[in-house]
């Protein structure tokens, strides 16, 4: 089967500081040296790009300076961290993997990770 399977966890709960991490793993049908990983957010049938990075196998992922994502790679596994999340950012975060080089190109899209974000309660004023 000329397809690339992408696996990611079904659900992740963001920390109280608005940080969520998950692993995106892909079964590579070819021996790619250049890989692009994109995180898409799907909410209310709207899809937006959260972040994207292209990396050479064996090297670190490089996101843009203003990206809310960071990540590391190990073989066919990418560890993604999204920060600065608030309750309104709750949604389905989809990992998309593209094997860019050498040809042939392969596309793999995960089923998505539902990230739940709960805004922390404000600290009550102290009477002391």
């Amino acid at each position: 089967c000329k397809a690339m399977h992408v696996a990611q966890p079904a659900v992740v709960l963001a920390s109280s500081r608005g940080i969520a991490s998950f692993v995106c793993e892909y079964a590579s049908p070819g021996k790619a040296t250049e890989v692009r990983v994109t995180v898409l957010r799907q909410a209310d049938s709207q899809v937006t790009e959260v972040c994207a990075a292209t990396y050479m196998m064996g090297n670190e992922l490089t996101f843009l300076d203003d990206s809310i994502c960071t990540g590391t790679s190990s073989g066919n596994q990418v560890n993604l961290t999204i920060q600065g999340l608030r309750a309104m950012d709750t949604g389905l975060y989809i990992c998309k993997v593209e094997l860019m080089y050498p040809p042939p190109y392969y596309l793999g899209i995960g089923n998505g990770t539902q990230i739940y974000v709960i805004d922390p309660e404000p600290c009550p004023d102290s009477d002391f």
């Epitope: 000329k2 397809a3 994109t38 790009e49 994207a52 040809p103 042939p104 190109y105 596309l107």
Partner: antibody, heavy 118, light 108 residues
Framework: QVQLVESGGGVVQPGRSLRLSCAAS????????MHWVRQAPGKGLEWVAV????????NYADSVKGRFTISRDNSKNTLYLQMNSLRVEDTAVYYC???????????WGQGTLVTVSS | EIVLTQSPGTLSLSPGERATLSCRAS???????LAWYQQKPGQAPRLLIY???SRATGIPDRFSGSGSGTDFTLTISRLEPEDFAVYYC?????????FGQGTKVEIK
């Protein structure tokens, strides 16, 4: 709204060259893969070439490899197809098309006709 | 290269009838990466279905897609006059991107 407008088609003799352009508007070109797809008169659709994101990665159909070059100028939001050593069998309507988030071709231009004839 | 074979080549039906178009792949295609397009004379193709069964934006619900592995189907539940056109399937999971040869749906 998303719009793709091709230009540069025309009648050319075998062995000659032609450059097609596709002006994109309504979206940021650098965030999308862009393809050229062609359709010979009365025939089906045939994929020609693709350029990805920053333009560093490209793929070509075997039928055009070594003769056609796809490129993009993201600052001008324009896609190109340089066609050299044209053959009669390259006669077709050439469409530029955008790849959406899911990898599918979601928007197409109106096409530009290239006729290779002596 | 994944070869897609569509059948029948031509489908002659009347408005209001059900149309069933088939697309068979030479090797297994993930259903996530199978699309259907509609093309009318003198016009560019228009995306109908992606991921084998998801309707593109603005596509009426009389169009539906199904299938997995090597066999995929596009169904038009009740043909409207504007549905008479040529339909192409496409796989987009790996290069080279390939299309079926098309099925023409014509008025009987």
């Amino acid at each position: 709204q998303v719009q793709l407008v091709e230009s540069g088609g025309g009648v050319v003799q075998p062995g000659r060259s032609l450059r097609l352009s596709c002006a994109a508007s309504g979206f940021t070109l650098s965030r999308y893969g862009m393809h050229w797809v062609r359709q010979a008169p009365g025939k089906g659709l045939e994929w020609v070439a693709v350029t990805w994101y920053d333009g560093s990665n490209k793929n070509y159909a075997d039928s055009v490899k070594g003769r056609f070059t796809i490129s993009r100028d993201n600052s001008k939001n324009t896609l190109y197809l340089q066609m050299n050593s044209l053959r009669v069998e390259d006669t077709a309507v050439y469409y530029c098309t955008r790849v959406d988030w899911w990898g599918v071709f979601d928007f197409w231009g109106q096409g530009t006709l290239v006729t290779v004839s002596s | 290269e994944i070869v897609l074979t569509q059948s029948p080549g031509t489908l002659s039906l009347s408005p209001g009838e059900r149309a069933t178009l088939s697309c068979r792949a030479s090797q297994s295609v993930s259903s996530s990466y199978l699309a259907w397009y509609q093309q009318k004379p003198g016009q560019a193709p228009r995306l109908l279905i992606y991921g084998a069964s998801s309707r593109a934006t603005g596509i009426p619900d009389r169009f539906s897609g199904s299938g997995s592995g090597t066999d995929f189907t596009l169904t038009i539940s009740r043909l409207e006059p504007e549905d008479f056109a040529v339909y192409y399937c496409q796989q987009y999971g790996s290069s080279p991107w390939t299309f079926g040869q098309g099925t023409k749906v014509e008025i009987k």
